[in-house]
């Protein structure tokens, strides 16, 4: 029951996280800035991974998409790539985890298959979360290092004088959404991986067993070793040779002609 709860909770947390990563990637407010020197009105500029917007105090907003790839900083391209990889991995992870959920029965899918799928989706969620956190952190670092306070450089261009407009860049809402979403996806992935351990089938309990014959007249029955899997002749999973079965953890006797495993 605890395994099902852990798996279900991991799925829900990851789902929320991936939804957040998608939202952050689409948002325009990755960086925000006030244009201090505007002589007309208060102007607020905010930009995301895909477009830049200017909002005036009158309420007018104009957005322009980054149609050119040449003028974009390499870091911005890297952030775009990280976020998209995060979304794709997360989406695949969600698809896999739906089929892996213990509460959902699909044909005669074994627990071992569900365990493997849970582990796979968990790893995908972890990588997805890390991609989102990395992407947001790279962008934040780009703001801090390059754009925190642009200096008022003045130089003369072909058409007259040019100077950099003094603007203060700050972290936009999308950065915080991205960090939280990435963290949630990461936590969800870890929960899925933990749930995977509990989903692993119990057949391993009888795999490492040495059978010691108690008498010279006892013969080996092929169905005995397969009892735990339910595929042998002993289909009711009754242990054969109870008196002589010992796990490898126990002290073992020296091999003799009566040891069959």
């Amino acid at each position: 029951m605890a395994v099902t709860a852990c798996q279900g909770l991991g799925f829900v947390v990851s789902l929320i996280g991936i939804a957040g990563i998608i939202a952050a990637t689409c948002m325009d407010q990755w960086s925000t800035q006030d244009l201090y020197n505007n002589p007309v009105t208060a102007v607020f500029n905010y930009q995301g991974l895909w477009r830049s917007c200017v909002r005036e105090s009158s309420g007018f907003t104009e957005c322009r998409g980054y149609f050119t790839l040449l003028g974009l900083p390499a870091m911005l391209q890297a952030v775009r790539a990280l976020m998209i990889v995060g979304i794709v991995l997360g989406a695949i992870g969600l698809l896999v985890s739906i089929f892996a959920l213990k509460c959902i029965r699909i044909g005669s899918m074994e627990d071992s298959a569900k365990a493997n799928m849970t582990l796979t989706s968990g790893i995908m969620f972890i990588v997805s979360g890390l991609c989102a956190i990395a992407g947001v952190s790279v962008f934040a670092n780009m703001l801090v290092t390059n754009f925190w306070m642009s200096t008022a450089n003045m130089y003369t261009g072909m058409g007259g004088m040019v100077q950099t407009v003094q603007t203060r860049y700050t972290f936009g809402a999308a950065l915080f959404v991205g960090w939280v979403a990435g963290g949630l996806t990461l936590i969800g992935g870890v929960m899925m991986c933990i749930a995977c351990r509990g989903l692993a089938p119990e057949e391993t309990n009888y795999k490492a067993v040495s059978y010691h014959a108690s008498g010279h007249s006892v013969a080996y029955k092929p169905g005995g070793f397969k009892a735990s899997t339910g595929f042998g002749s002993n289909t009711k999973n009754k242990k054969i040779y109870d008196g002589g079965a010992r796990t490898e953890d126990e002290v073992q006797s020296y091999p003799s002609k009566h040891d069959y495993v």
Epitope: S31, V43, E56, F60
Partner: nanobody
Framework: QVQLVESGGGLVQPGGSLRLSCAAS????????MGWYRQAPGKQRELVAA???????KYSDSVKGRFTISRDNAKNTVYLQMNSLKPEDTAVYYC????????????????WGQGTQVTVSS
């Protein structure tokens, strides 16, 4: 490379009219505010009028009611219609624009034109 090219200046009699125009050209990504400043001999450069992309305007007190600023966003061009000109309007008129270039979509630059001479004299 971005260029601001002013035109329409010249000699005019007091009470006359002139229409200045300024076209921004080059690798422009986004323009915010465009405006006109003027500098009379021996004086500091002062704002005449400015207009944002959304159409919000600001005029200096000395030109209110006489000058009208307008803008064509599609052509990246700003106009200044000057009526009832006075001798004290004589100055070099500079076009100004806050913009981002395609080569750096994260930084705003303030570009200035070379200026056009307006002389009001009888």
């Amino acid at each position: 490379q971005v260029q601001l090219v002013e035109s329409g200046g010249g000699l005019v009699q007091p009470g006359g009219s002139l229409r200045l125009s300024c076209a921004a050209s080059g690798s422009i990504f986004q323009i915010n505010t465009m405006g006109w400043y003027r500098q009379a001999p021996g004086k500091q450069r002062e704002l005449v009028a400015a207009i944002t992309t959304g159409g919000s305007t600001k005029y200096s007190d000395s030109v209110k009611g006489r000058f009208t600023i307008s803008r064509d966003n599609a052509k990246n061009t700003v106009y200044l219609q000057m009526n009832s000109l006075k001798p004290e309007d004589t100055a070099v008129y500079y076009c100004n624009a806050d913009l981002k270039t395609n080569s750096n979509v994260f930084t705003w630059y303030e570009y200035w034109g070379q200026g056009t001479q307006v002389t009001v004299s009888s």
